[in-house]
């Protein structure tokens, strides 16, 4: 039966389809060899012979079997806010990761084509939920008990301390003054550290409502047009080449 | 299960532009080419061509070059014959056919009448 | 272009009788030990329905009374015994290479 030809090419049987590793030639009408990754065709089979692979060249890929005629051209270099994570080689493209202490803004299908710096959260401000690599770092006002006295990505609010005598109040900004020599931390939300509390709370003012974040700039990385579908099922080519396999 | 279904009857005057189409289902329209096949009342069959269904490339046998256009709808899976300034001679059945070696898988067929 | 010629016209073949069409191609429709010939089944109103592919392939589905035999260039499609719902135009079609032809169709009557 035709379908039991061991070789490539060959006609397949009514309903049925290539076999692993295989294409249908819409040309040749025939089930033929796809190139192994690293590899692509050369030239496309006929119904005499096989497809011809060959190796990608350098700054090119293939990480599928395919039939493509040209080999991807692997992504630009990793801008200066990235980090390169894969390397470009003949079976796979180069991947750019955002550096630490920036996150992706806009993804591609591996790495990241837009990377930004993750949000600082001003002073009366803490981390609400932490900066991720497709995240921004979303900040909260501190509630009342609580504060943040930097521009920082990584703090939260943390509490007050308690005076057994105040010396200045404490608010979203600014921690309590105490003229206590052994002041002790109040149980606040947002606070991380829960100490037992003494009987008296400092006094603590709400912040004036302000921008929560301190002005960033991104950078846009080259953005190239999207490489051709590599190892689909369809047929990519349509012209006869005489080779061998 | 893999079907192709045509497009209704059409009655046309000579002069006139038809367009039949063939709407697949059941496997990946860009893996298989697509055939046309002209059938006359009371005749064989004859192979007009076919279409690229991956690159929309098409290839007309010698006596349907000119008027006759294949064409393409990707996104709906569907392949479309277009026939311009009918004749007399134009009349008969028109199939599409699944474009492999041994071809099972055939359209219902649409019959183009075409009359003054 | 390879000219398929199919033998009989017609012929007319009593209930449970064989019917055998021949068809010559111009040139051989071989390659690689496949024989690219294929025989169609057509009734009125209806697409042509695949019943022999590769010469003596029997398409899934299709009874055993068809059958298909050749090489090279001649080709034979035998039916036996033949049943009422026979009653149709057969074609040969050759794959080998484009264009894709048919023969001329061979009408089959039950007597």
């Known amino acids: 039966l035709p379908a039991q030809v061991a070789f490539t090419p060959y006609a397949p049987e009514p309903g049925s389809t290539c076999r692993l590793r295989e294409y249908y030639d819409q040309t040749a009408q025939m089930c033929c060899s796809k190139c192994s990754p690293g590899q692509h065709a050369k030239v496309f089979c006929t119904k005499t012979s096989d497809t011809v692979c060959d190796s990608c060249e350098d700054s090119t890929y293939t990480q599928l079997w395919n039939w493509v005629p040209e080999c991807l051209s692997c992504g630009s270099r990793c801008s200066s806010d990235q980090v390169e994570t894969q390397a470009c080689t003949r079976e796979q493209n180069r991947i750019c990761t955002c550096r630490p202490g920036w996150y992706c803004a806009l993804s591609k299908q591996e790495g990241c084509r837009l990377c930004a710096p993750l949000r600082k959260c001003r002073p009366g401000f803490g981390v609400a939920r932490p900066g991720t690599e497709t995240s921004d770092v979303v900040c909260k006002p501190c509630a009342p008990g609580t504060f943040s006295n930097t521009t920082s990505s990584t703090d939260i609010c943390r509490p007050h301390q308690i005076c057994n005598v105040v010396a200045i109040p404490g608010n979203a900004s600014m921690d309590a003054v105490c003229t206590s020599t052994s002041p002790t931390r109040s149980m606040a939300p947002g606070a991380v550290h829960l100490p037992q509390p003494v009987s008296t709370r400092s006094q603590h003012t709400q912040p004036t409502p302000e921008p929560s974040t301190a002005p960033s700039t991104s950078f846009l990385l080259p953005m190239g047009p999207s490489p051709p579908a590599e190892g689909s099922t369809g047929d990519h080519h349509h012209h006869h080449h005489h080779h061998h396999h | 299960q893999i079907q192709l279904v045509q497009s209704g009857p059409e009655l046309k005057k000579p002069g006139e532009t038809v367009k039949i189409s063939c709407k697949t289902s059941g496997y990946t329209f860009t893996i298989y080419g697509m055939n046309w096949v002209k059938q006359a009342p009371g005749k064989g069959l004859k192979w007009m061509g076919w279409i690229h269904t991956y690159t929309g490339e098409p290839t007309y046998a010698d006596d349907f070059k000119g008027r006759f256009v294949f064409s393409l709808e990707t996104s709906d899976s569907t392949a479309y014959l277009q026939i311009n300034n009918l004749k007399s001679e134009d009349m008969a059945t028109y199939f599409c056919?699944?474009?492999?070696?041994?071809?099972?898988?055939w359209g219902q067929g649409t019959l183009v009448t075409v009359s003054a | 272009d390879i000219v398929l010629t199919q033998s009989p016209a017609s012929l007319a073949v009593s209930l449970g009788q064989r019917a055998t069409i021949s068809c010559t191609a111009s040139q051989s429709v071989d390659y690689g030990g496949v024989s690219y010939m294929n025989w169609y089944q057509q009734k009125p109103g209806q697409p042509p329905k695949l019943l022999i592919y590769?010469?003596?392939n029997q398409e899934s589905g299709i009874p055993v009374r068809f059958s298909g035999s050749g090489s090279g260039t001649d080709f034979t499609l035998n039916i036996h015994p033949v049943e009422e719902e026979d009653a149709a135009t057969y074609y040969c079609?050759?794959?080998?290479?484009?264009?894709?032809?048919f023969g001329a169709g061979t009408k089959l009557e039950l007597k």
């Open positions: 056919v699944r474009r492999e070696r041994y071809g099972s898988f």
């Open positions: 590769g010469a003596s």
């Open positions: 079609q050759q794959s080998n290479e484009d264009p894709p032809t």
